[in-house]
């Protein structure tokens, strides 16, 4: 089939990185700069993606593959192939329509992206709070009070914080 096809269509012989140039008797011409063809037999080359503005070039376009973008410092990629750049926030914050806002009490975010998530409820697993949560860190759950039979463990439950859930300043 390939042999028959190539006899009928000279363009099928053009490899990736070239295009079948109708202006030059259908010979295979290299893709111009800023364009590429990832498969053979193409009659045109595709225009390369340009990483502009908040995007920056992570990988230059080659004759056979498109450019790849990432985001400038202070932003991170969202979507397939980094189709969008979203502003970073600090740990302990989340991005809202009004900008970066601190996590509400009882929630945390340990990354520069994403939303604030509720602290783990230790009691649901029958455990106690070993280390209190902060805006930046989840609580650390310890053994359940029942596990702390006299002499069985040297772990001392933490003194309650002045503001529940937050470490003492």
């Amino acid at each position: 089939f390939e042999r028959t096809r190539s006899l009928q269509d000279p363009c099928s012989n053009c490899p990736a990185g070239t295009f079948c140039d109708n202006n030059r008797n259908q010979i295979c011409s290299p893709c111009p700069p800023n364009s590429f063809s990832s498969a053979g037999g193409q009659r045109t080359c595709d225009i390369c993606r340009q990483c502009k503005g908040v995007f920056r070039t992570r990988k230059e376009c080659s004759s056979t593959s498109n450019a790849e973008c990432d985001c400038t410092p202070g932003f991170h990629c969202l979507g397939a192939g980094c189709s969008m750049c979203e502003q970073d926030c600090k740990q302990g914050q989340e991005l809202t329509k009004k900008g970066c806002k601190d996590c509400c009490f009882g929630t945390f975010n340990d990354q520069k992206r994403g939303i604030c998530r509720p602290w783990t409820n230790c009691s649901l697993d029958g455990k106690s709070v070993l280390v209190n949560g902060t805006k930046e860190r989840d609580v650390v759950c310890g053994p359940s009070p029942a596990d702390l039979s006299p002499g069985a463990s040297s772990v001392t439950p933490p003194a309650p914080a002045r503001e529940p859930g937050h470490s003492p300043q």
Epitope: P32, K59, E68
Partner: antibody
Framework: QVQLQQSGAELTRPGASVKLSCKAS????????IQWIKQRPGQGLEWIGT????????RYTQKFKGKATLTADKSSSTAYMQLSSLASEDSAVYYC??????????WGQGTTLTVSS | DILLTQSPAILSVSPGERVSFSCRAS??????IHWYQQRTNGSPRLLIK???ESISGIPSRFSGSGSGTDFTLTINSVESEDIADYYC?????????FGGGTKLEMK
């Protein structure tokens, strides 16, 4: 930080060949075109060619086809340019530079080639 | 092949003056032109990409304009450190090429 470290000055005889190197660091070597540029004393910049290290794809200006051969070693993140059948007019500073389509953002320090009998 | 012609070959200016460099392409190249500065005994450095896009770390007094065949690099207020050679490069078609350069000198 991105750096392109070029090999040291070369003094060679006419008719000989020489291989210049350009060692890249501070970025993913396979992700950007490497250009090679010639500059004779007191003259302008002359484009020789370019290589895409990921797949070895090369482009040359007509004048340097047969004179220059561009290669890239991914394992050492080094680009090479071999110049053959050297003559006095090949005496020049040769630069490698990273990036092509959006301009060359980073340049090596240049290698001085002197061809003399 | 696309030929790039830079003019004039030499520009003489006084500090604080506004100066413009011309780069003309032998056929239309869209905005695929980049500008470089090369000081004496130094490697070139990229000033402007795609005719008018600024480069991080380059002083704001450098700007570029143009599309098609005529392009201009402008220095808004020349400083002594700007004394150098200036080159344009096209990356619209193979083989890419540099212009012949313009030397900027102080009066």
């Amino acid at each position: 930080q991105v750096q392109l470290q070029q090999s040291g000055a070369e003094l060679t005889r006419p008719g000989a060949s020489v291989k210049l190197s350009c060692k890249a660091s501070g970025y993913t070597f396979t992700n950007y075109w490497i250009q090679w540029i010639k500059q004779r004393p007191g003259q302008g910049l002359e484009w020789i060619g370019t290589i895409y290290p990921e797949n070895g794809d090369t482009r040359y200006t007509q004048k340097f086809k047969g004179k220059a051969t561009l290669t890239a070693d991914k394992s050492s993140s080094t680009a090479y340019m071999q110049l053959s059948s050297l003559a006095s007019e090949d005496s020049a500073v040769y630069y490698c530079a990273r990036g092509l389509l959006e301009g060359a953002h980073y340049w090596g320090q240049g290698t001085t080639l002197t061809v003399s009998s | 092949d696309i030929l790039l012609t830079q003019s004039p070959a030499i520009l003489s200016v006084s500090p604080g003056e506004r100066v413009s460099f011309s780069c003309r392409a032998s056929q239309s190249i869209g905005a695929s032109i980049h500008w470089y500065q090369q000081r004496t005994n130094g490697s070139p450095r990229l000033l402007i990409k795609f005719s008018s896009e600024s480069i991080s770390g380059i002083p704001s007094r450098f700007s570029g304009s143009g599309s098609g065949t005529d392009f201009t690099l402008t220095i808004n207020s020349v400083e002594s450190e700007d004394i150098a050679d200036y080159y344009c490069q096209q990356t619209n078609s193979w083989p890419t090429a540099f212009g012949g350069g313009t030397k900027l000198e102080m009066k």
